[in-house]
Interface confidence: low
């Protein structure tokens, strides 16, 4: 089939005192090969500080997955979610505290 670029959605949730969990979800993409990782100051975080979901079919012939990490509140601007799919790539910031969703359909 033809390439379908992912929708990328970054959310944040309270984790513990002074920390938040940031989650980057990629959905509705095809083919299933994708790179999704958190970066800090432009460098990918080590694997042991991130948690990945499986790349799963979403029932529409496309796929979805996610990656999450825990960061210190106040340092959100240093973190971005990096996505690479079918030769295209994009970076997605952590939303500010009063805006919990960030959607980006990558073309």
């Amino acid at each position: 089939g033809s390439t379908v670029p992912p929708m990328v959605n970054v959310t944040r949730s309270e984790a513990s005192e002074g920390n938040i969990t940031v989650t980057c979800r990629a959905s509705s993409f095809y083919p299933r090969n994708i790179i999704l990782t958190w970066r800090q100051d432009g460098v990918s975080l080590s694997h042991d500080t991130q948690q990945w979901g499986d790349v799963l079919p979403d029932g529409n012939g496309t796929y979805q997955t996610w990656v999450a990490t825990r960061i210190c509140r106040g340092e959100e601007q240093r973190f971005t979610c990096y996505m690479e799919h079918s030769g295209n790539h994009s970076t997605h910031p952590v939303p500010s505290g009063n805006s919990h969703h960030h959607h980006h359909h990558h073309h």
């Epitope: 432009g42 460098v43 080590s46 690479e84 790539h89």
Partner: antibody, heavy 119, light 108 residues
Framework: DVHLVESGGGLVQPGGSRKLSCAAS????????MNWVRQAPEKGLEWVAY????????YYADTVKGRFTISRDNPKNTLFLQMTSLRSEDTAMYYC????????????WGQGTLVTVSA | QIVLTQSPAFKSSSLGERVTMTCTAS???????LHWYQQKPGSSPKLWIY???NLASGVPARFSGSGSGTSYSLTISTMEAEDAATYYC?????????FGSGTKVEIK
Amino acid sequence: DVHLVESGGGLVQPGGSRKLSCAASGFTFNTFGMNWVRQAPEKGLEWVAYINSGSNTIYYADTVKGRFTISRDNPKNTLFLQMTSLRSEDTAMYYCTRWEPVTGGFSYWGQGTLVTVSA
Amino acid sequence: QIVLTQSPAFKSSSLGERVTMTCTASSSISSSYLHWYQQKPGSSPKLWIYTTSNLASGVPARFSGSGSGTSYSLTISTMEAEDAATYYCHQHHRSPFTFGSGTKVEIK
């Protein structure tokens, strides 16, 4: 203009210690990751260590892990490399480099400071 | 760790000649994490090509970079005297970050 000036090099005996410094100017130091890269005489480049802007993500080359410590003092715009248990193979020019946060890569380099490990 | 193998190690080229050097990674890396540096004797290295194919500021248009997966290359379309230098590829796809061993380009 961005300037990175390394200091602290010199002659050290095997097993000895040395602390290198890198004074940064011309940019907002506390928002950039920094690295040390070294080059042995007539040899290629070897990445040594990386520290992010907040000092909470640090990576080392396998060859220096457990012996070298990278750190930074953001208010003083200074990067450090504490080297212990030095070996002859640590003899090299040590460069301080600034990380490019958007594209990656080392966009700025200092002039280097030479560390010679010899009896 | 990801090992970067550069070839040739040494290249003697005539002025005006097309020069191509390669950088092969021991495992697949993202093209966003592959860069090239130029170094001349007695000087610090300079970022030359970033994210596989983008020329750094001030780099002449005769330089180009390409590649994906495990295979990357730097090409000088028409060799000029000022291009004589050593070129290193570098990856930060995964820590520890690594450099290739370099390709030294000289004028024939």
